[in-house]
């Protein structure tokens, strides 16, 4: 109708970092700007994704380099975690979030794919991070090894050597374990403070110039006291699990406070293992019960569970692996080990901006099942899983629903601002929730919307639409790309209107009749009045159409709802060669060229287009007869 | 030569306090606990306090506690009792006593007392 | 608490007699148990240690034992110079709190 096809500006990119993936329009006091994501963006040897401005009218895009900021505390995996996924603009400051859903952390053996988020100002500065399903890793310890290096102590060499191989069974490393290590005989001394040292490597490499420091005393109940109340507070992290891990050869020269170190230890919520090596008492043929009992005494009840003794220092590296089993033992601790939480979450799959914080997807959370949390100033809300039920029962738990492919919200005259989002894959055949959410971790679903056809993917792409811009949604509507029509993966856009307080399904928003793939409906977004008609417009993309090269269609508001049939279809093919995907994102909020006119930004495989508006020229014809 | 001397004791008022002191030589006061231990008149062996020298853990008997202090200057190698709000009962010969880990654990050597005696 | 139940309270006995005196704990208890020997107007002296261990420079007639929760001070051929107060002394295990019995005479009969 009126997007000029003939001068758009193709701003170029690469295609295999996939810039384009996402759009949006950007304005920093009066300079306009587009956003875009590059998901599949190298950053030196790791494929980060990443997000790139660039200007509107001419000049290059410059890449962000959102796909270097780091979280500090966690052991992080960036590669393959497509940054600019999702991207989501707050019209209030005009800041912006990029979303990296594969973002990853190490916990123990396992990678985490909790996702994170970037909050961007409106100058483009990276000001925060967000990641609302980030867990302390189990493997968050701090451990520390009370060594006795008494005389008695012989070959020194071995009690090396077992320090050498239970360090390297630890996951050292930010936001997992710290090692501290001390000696103690008639005296204690650190021999490297917990956060002296940040991977195995460098705390083995510690480890192996540990000399024995003797003593003729074995001050057991010193050395644990000081590893409480001193190592443990040296370097030690608020929050982490206190392990410690005694190990010695003989009975102490100073039991009997024993019992008030153990109650201080206890206190301190510290867990000890504790190693009686019997060779002494083997050598000399001494009978060592009451050694063994002490150092019972020591280690955390149960003893079967904390309590080893070996026959002489050879023999300690016979307990190695038994003692890294039990210390990550504790990682399960109450957990159900065959069920995931928010541990692959994927957070930031999608993500909408609201009054008070931001809605981020989770598509992999309670085993990809999904949901959809929120991130505010005062904090977060993650719902639990019992939450869902009601609309995702139990039977169907293990079919992976995705919800929080996509959020997005509705505003209702009667019930304020409520939440939607899209599960593609309920039941195989898709649906969309309409619900509120609780601080107390709950969630009111209002109403639920289902597909019609397996793998039509209907709640993939979802959009609210205030046609007359009162601040009420108008029209809802869900979109099934992968809808399978006449032979082919033509897609579908349906069209639900606001009656009171429901949503209720008005039929389908048309597209072309080719008869080759067109997942029309991949992106649906609402923009503001292109025709100068005062309502507001929807417009919608189908990359696939066009053999791939892909078309977007134009459908104006009017009175309260959206008209079915497009007023515009552009395909990639009038405006470039070579463009592919075009339509695969949309955005379309902002005059970008000052002439007074909504323009719109639209994606594609390696590209970015800007298609400008033109004014409608409205001719009103009327007739004087004279004579009359 | 092990030896345990203690001094301080008295006659006192009811209510009143008195600081015996338990003068070691021969050991190493850091390397050892030292108990007070006494035995009124007639009467039997009651234990009175204990402390480590080196990690200064104290325990008390319930008879005594909150009134009285032990404590202990590895520098002087002396233990100290400090007893406060005494009563007419707390009169007694009060002995200190090394406790350690070569002894496994028994009082081997004594002091040779002192007497504290409460009365108005 | 864990008490030492001392018996006989006293006990009369001629020159060359055995005697033995037990010490009964009221809850099981490890082996640090002592016996002392204390003469009028003298401080305590160290016996038996660990229960059964017989302290240095202490004759060999004095000897200790333990079944169970009982211990046992035997003296085998009592002499002139052990007629004196006899106590038991039990240490708790990794504290130093210690409780003593209540002590057992042995007179000359």
């Known amino acids: 109708f009126n997007m000029d096809t003939r001068k758009p500006r193709v701003i170029p990119g690469s295609r295999t970092a996939f810039f384009g993936y996402t759009v949006q329009q950007h304005d920093i006091s009066g300079n306009k700007w587009l956003v875009v994501g590059a998901p599949l963006e190298t950053n030196g040897y790791q494929k980060t994704g990443d997000v790139y401005k660039c200007p509107v009218i001419h000049g290059n895009c410059t890449k962000l380099n959102l796909g270097r900021v780091t979280l500090s505390n966690v052991s992080e995996r960036k590669d393959n975690m497509r940054l600019g996924l999702s991207l989501a603009t707050n019209p209030k400051d005009n800041s912006f979030l990029a979303c990296s859903p594969l973002w990853s952390h190490e916990c123990g053996s396992s990678y985490y794919t909790t996702g994170m988020c970037s909050r961007v100002n409106s100058n483009f500065r990276f000001s925060k991070t967000v990641a609302p399903a980030l867990q302390r890793c189990q493997t968050y310890m701090d451990i520390v090894i009370v060594l006795d290096g008494s005389n008695s102590i012989y070959p020194w060499v071995e009690v090396q050597h077992f320090l050498i191989n239970i360090l390297k069974k630890f996951y050292i490393g930010p936001g997992q374990i710290q090692v501290g290590v001390v000696q103690y005989g008639e005296d204690v001394v650190h021999e490297f403070h917990l956060n002296d040292y940040r991977s195995v490597k460098d705390v083995v490499e510690a480890a192996s110039h540990i000399e024995q420091r003797g003593g003729t005393e074995t001050r057991t109940a010193f050395g644990i006291e000081f590893a409480r109340s001193e190592a443990f507070q040296k370097g030690g992290r608020k929050g982490a699990k206190k392990v410690m891990i005694v190990i010695t050869d003989g009975e102490s020269h100073d039991s009997p406070d024993l019992e008030k170190v153990i109650q201080q230890s206890e206190r301190d919520n510290v867990t000890r293992y504790a190693v009686a090596v019997l060779g002494y008492y083997n050598r000399r043929g001494i009978n060592p019960e009451t050694f063994l009992n002490e150092i019972k005494y020591i280690a955390s009840d149960p003893d079967d569970k904390h309590f080893f003794n070996v026959t002489d220092e050879a023999a300690l590296k016979d307990i190695v692996d038994a003692l890294g089993d039990r210390i990550f033992s504790l990682e399960g601790t109450n957990k159900n080990e065959t069920s995931f939480g928010l541990e692959m979450s994927q957070t930031g799959f999608s993500s909408h901006v609201v009054e008070d914080g931001v809605l981020l997807g989770a598509v992999g959370a309670y085993d990809w099942n999904g949901a959809v949390l929120k991130e505010t100033s005062a904090g977060k809300v993650i719902p639990l899983r019992e939450s869902y039920l009601k609309e995702f029962p139990e039977e169907l738990k293990n079919h992976g629903a995705y919800l929080g492919y996509t959020v997005t919200s509705v505003v209702s005259s009667r019930q304020g601002r409520v939440y939607v989002a899209g599960a593609p894959r309920f039941n195989h055949t898709g649906k969309v929730i309409l619900f509120t959410m609780h601080n107390n971790r709950s969630l009111t679903i209002h109403q639920a919307m289902r597909g019609q056809q397996i793998g039509s993917y209907f709640g993939s792409e979802i959009t609210s639409v205030d046609i007359d811009g009162d601040g009420v949604t108008d029209v809802l509507l869900v979109g099934a790309p992968m809808y399978f029509n006449e032979g082919r993966e033509r897609g579908k856009v349906y069209v639900y209107e606001l009656r009171q307080n429901l949503f209720v399904y008005n039929g389908t928003l048309k597209d072309s009749h080719s008869y080759q793939n067109a997942r029309f409906g991949s992106s649906i977004a609402s923009v503001r009045d292109l025709n100068q008609d005062s309502y507001n417009d929807v417009v919608v993309g189908a990359p696939l159409e066009d053999n791939h090269a892909g078309a977007i269609y134009i459908f104006h508001g009017f009175r309260g709802s959206i008209l079915k049939t497009p007023k515009q279809r552009i395909t990639a093919s009038e405006l470039a060669t070579g463009l592919q995907y075009f339509g695969c994102s949309i955005h379309g909020q902002l005059d970008l060229n000052e002439d007074g006119l909504i323009d719109l930004a639209v994606g594609a495989l390696g590209n970015a287009v800007i298609l400008w508006s033109r004014p409608v020229v409205q001719i009103n014809a009327s007739l004087h007869f004279e004579p009359s | 030569e092990v030896q345990l001397v203690e001094s301080g004791g008295g006659l006192v008022q009811p209510g009143g306090s008195l600081r015996l002191s338990c003068a070691a030589s021969g050991f190493n006061l850091q390397s050892s606990y030292i108990h007070w231990v006494r035995q009124a008149p007639g009467k039997g062996l009651e234990w009175v306090a204990s402390?480590?020298?080196?990690?200064?853990?104290?325990y008390y008997a319930d008879s005594v506690k909150g009134r009285f202090t032990i404590s202990a200057d590895t520098s002087k190698n002396t233990a100290y009792l400090q007893m406060n709000s005494l009563r007419a009962e707390d009169t007694a010969v009060y002995y200190c006593?090394?406790?350690?880990?070569?002894?496994?654990?028994?009082?081997?050597?004594w002091g040779q007392g002192t007497l504290v005696t409460v009365s108005s | 608490d864990i008490q030492m139940t001392q018996s006989p309270s006293s006990l009369s006995a001629s020159v060359g007699d055995r005697v033995t005196i037990t010490c009964r704990a009221s809850q099981s208890v490890s082996s640090a148990v002592a016996w002392y020997q204390q003469k009028p107007g003298k401080a305590p002296k160290l016996l038996i240690y660990?229960?059964?261990s017989l302290y240095s420079g202490v004759p060999s007639r004095f000897s200790g034992s333990r079944s169970g929760t009982d211990f046992t001070l035997t003296i085998s051929s009592l002499q002139p110079e052990d007629f004196a107060t006899y106590y038991c002394q039990q240490s708790a295990p990794y504290s130093s709190l210690i409780t003593f019995g209540q002590g057992t005479k042995v007179e000359i009969k």
């Open positions: 006593a090394r406790y350690w880990y070569y002894s496994a654990w028994a009082l081997d050597y």
């Open positions: 660990s229960a059964s």
């Open positions: 402390i480590s020298s080196y990690s200064s853990y104290t």
